[in-house]
Structure formats: structure tokens, C-alpha cells
Interface confidence: low
């Protein structure tokens, strides 16, 4: 053995943000010839010894952190990075606005504001086409998302979600889309 078994990848298809009652597939991908996979939901006793978990209709109880590993011979791989499976549409959608407005000159500043009438303490902003929340690496934000020195790359469609830190995998429906235009 020349090194530890590399960790597999775990992905959610089509997305890790899943509207309630919609389908999602979790797929664990290791090297060819794997003897056995283990796909599990953390902080629960739920696991399966298969590489693919098909969820035909997303439920609140299925939201949470998942990870997988695989076995070759008697050896187990390092675990995959955790995948956070989020149920969306649990709460009413927030509103997303741009200050001073959705049309901004290149080099200017704009602030996207996500507002909700509920007492949520967490907000996430997504740009269409980007896999991660806006302003990675810090994952969650308050209601204001400042974009300093706007460039053409910031153009696009944005949506935000609100949720509570008490239930971090149960999110609101997405806001109506906001089109940011950089001139």
C-alpha cells in the first residue's frame, strides 16, 4: 500500500438545495473497483451500504449533513467532505433588493439586501451559475451583502434565502430573482 485510500467525492444532483417534495440523488464517487460504499447522515443512525441514495421527495427530516466512505479489501478510505443537504421552501420567501439600485456602473458599489418578516438570524445569497453562496469562504451572512468595486463578473441573477441557526438545513423558499446589471 503506497498511501491511504483517497477520499471519495459526494455530490447532490441536481443540487444540494432541494425544494420540499422534489427529488434529489446523493452520489458517492470513489475509484474504480470499490468493494463497498457507506453513505450516512451525520448525527443520526441513518446509513446505507450503497453509493447512491435516491430521495424521491425531499422531507424536512432528510435535511442535514451527509458523508460517505468506501472499503477496498479490509481498508476504509478517508471520509468524503461533508455535503450539506438543505430543504428549501420550508418558510415563506424573503425579498431581495439592491441599494441604491439594480443597475450599477463598473467600479461602483452596491449592496444587496435580503429581508424577511420572520425572526431569522441567517441569510444566504446565491448567484445563478455559482455553486457556492456569495462571498465564499464565509458561508452565512446577515441581511446585507455589500459588493465593493463592482465588475462585469458581478452581473447576473441573484436569489437569497433566510433560515434560523437553530435549524440550519431548513431554509425559506428563494426570493424572487434580482437581476444585477453592470454598465
Amino acid at each position: 500500500q503506497s498511501g491511504p485510500l483517497p477520499k471519495p467525492s459526494l455530490q447532490a444532483l441536481p443540487s444540494s438545495l432541494v425544494p420540499l417534495e422534489k427529488p434529489v440523488t446523493l452520489r458517492c464517487q470513489g475509484p474504480p473497483g470499490v468493494d463497498l460504499y457507506r453513505l450516512e447522515k451525520l448525527s443520526s443512525s441513518r446509513y446505507q451500504d450503497q453509493a447512491v441514495l435516491f430521495i424521491p421527495a425531499m422531507k424536512r427530516s432528510l435535511a442535514g449533513r451527509y458523508r460517505c466512505s468506501y472499503q477496498n479489501g479490509s481498508l476504509w478510505s478517508l471520509p468524503s467532505d461533508q455535503l450539506e443537504l438543505v430543504a428549501t421552501g420550508v418558510f415563506a420567501k424573503p425579498s431581495l433588493s439592491a441599494q441604491p439600485g439594480p443597475a450599477v456602473s463598473s467600479g461602483g458599489d452596491v449592496t444587496l439586501q435580503c429581508q424577511t418578516r420572520y425572526g431569522f438570524d441567517q441569510f444566504a445569497l446565491y448567484k445563478e451559475g455559482d455553486p457556492a453562496p456569495y462571498k465564499n469562504p464565509e458561508r452565512w451572512y446577515r441581511a446585507s451583502f455589500p459588493i465593493i468595486t463592482v465588475t462585469a463578473a458581478h452581473s447576473g441573477t441573484y436569489r437569497c434565502y433566510s433560515f434560523s441557526s437553530r435549524d440550519p438545513y431548513l431554509w425559506s423558499a428563494p426570493s424572487d430573482p434580482l437581476e444585477l446589471v453592470v454598465t
Epitope: P4, L42, S43, S45, Y47, L78, A132, P137, R139
Partner: antibody, heavy 114, light 106 residues
């Protein structure tokens, strides 16, 4: 070759803040997480928190309000920031790769004292 | 948070002998336990992950077993270079170290 190297201030005043940098080589921060662990003098190892490849973070619950972990993927650097320091934060601080922690730095010693 | 109770806190054994260290988790950790060797002036070294999988280059004198909440780590044919402090680590939900076991040679 995988390597992690911690660098810190050495001495910090009580109620001050601590900033430590972990510079990594031999792997990409987009594909691996990095943990922070400390060891007070004469005591055991204590996990502080972790930043994942995608940038999300986990923290030990008792330290969550005082800790912040961030990174700069392009510079292969991970940053630990801790505020409201107390004398019992005196420890050797280590960074270590991913889950479980398969590679470690040698650590940097931090003393909290006036 | 998951707690890990490691015992004993110290032990002494003879060269060629065998020692066993145990860790008990406060809840089922589904075999997500690792064992580390820590020598003064160095960073800890990962010996075993996922209960029993040895890291490359780690001698087969080291072994691990267990399930549920109860886990053990053993060193057989003890060597002078095994003098160190050993820690268990659960990584089922966040991470928690055991308190450590300081191993001395008689």
C-alpha cells in the same frame, strides 16, 4: 510533500486578540479542510475548529463566540483568529489537514500574559 | 457535543509487552475514531483511522477495534520508540479528543 507551517505572535496580552496563520504546501485548500488544535502546557489536545474545502466552518461549541477561521486559497493560507484572550488560552496551537487529521504542523507557542 | 473518556491516563509496560488503551464515547460514533501518537516537540501522528485502518508506514504492532460507543487501541511487542502520549479522536460529529494516555517503558 504535504507540509503545514504555523506562525503566530508568541506573546499576547489578556483580553487581546490572537491571529495565527497556517501556510500549507503539497495539497490544495479547495480540496481539503484544515483543522486547528491546541495543547495547553501539561494538558491534552483540544480541537478548536475547522474550515472545509468549500469554505464552510465548524467550531467547538464552547469557543464558537471567540473564534473565527478563514482562508485564502490562492495563498494556501488558513487563518485562526481568537478574541477576548485569557491566560488559560496559553497553549501550543497546531493546524492539521482534513478528517481525520493526517498531517500536522509542528505548532506555534502562544503565551497570554501581561 | 460528543465526549470521549480515555483510560488509563498513564501506564507503564516492559519492552516486548502489550498495552491496551480504551476510549468510550458519550454516544454511538459509528466507528469514526482515530488514534494518534504524540511525542514532545513534534506534531501528533495519525496511526489509525476508522477504528482499525492503519496509516501507511505504521507497524502492524499497532491495532484498533470497537464499535458503537466502545473502542480500544493496542500496541504489541512494545518498543522503546513507542514512548509517547496517545490520543483517541472521534470525528462522527464535529471532533473531540480523549484526554490522552502517557505511555512509559519500565
Amino acid at each position: 510533500e504535504v507540509q503545514l507551517l504555523e506562525s503566530g505572535p508568541g506573546l499576547v496580552a489578556p483580553s487581546g486578540s490572537l491571529s495565527i496563520t497556517c501556510t500549507v504546501s503539497g495539497f490544495s485548500l479547495t480540496g481539503y479542510g484544515v483543522n486547528w488544535v491546541r495543547q495547553p502546557p501539561g494538558k491534552g489536545l483540544e480541537w478548536l475548529g475547522m474550515i472545509w474545502g468549500d469554505g464552510s466552518t465548524d467550531y467547538q461549541s464552547t469557543l464558537k463566540s471567540r473564534l473565527s477561521i478563514s482562508k485564502d486559497n490562492s495563498k494556501s493560507q488558513v487563518f485562526l483568529k481568537m478574541n477576548s484572550l485569557r491566560t488559560d488560552d496559553t497553549a501550543r496551537y497546531y493546524c492539521a489537514r482534513d478528517l481525520p487529521m493526517d498531517y500536522w504542523g509542528l505548532g506555534t507557542s502562544v503565551t497570554v500574559s501581561s | 457535543d460528543i465526549q470521549m473518556t480515555q483510560s488509563p491516563s498513564s501506564l507503564s509496560a516492559s519492552v516486548g509487552g502489550r498495552v491496551t488503551i480504551t476510549c468510550k464515547a458519550s454516544q454511538d460514533i459509528n466507528k469514526y475514531i482515530a488514534w494518534y501518537q504524540h511525542k514532545p516537540g513534534k506534531g501528533p501522528s495519525l496511526l489509525i483511522h476508522y477504528t482499525s485502518t492503519l496509516q501507511p508506514g505504521v507497524p502492524s504492532r499497532f491495532s484498533g477495534s470497537g464499535s458503537g460507543r466502545d473502542y480500544s487501541f493496542s500496541i504489541s511487542n512494545l518498543q522503546p520508540e513507542d514512548i509517547a502520549t496517545y490520543y483517541c479522536l472521534q470525528y462522527a460529529n464535529l471532533l473531540t479528543f480523549g484526554g490522552g494516555t502517557k505511555l512509559e517503558i519500565k
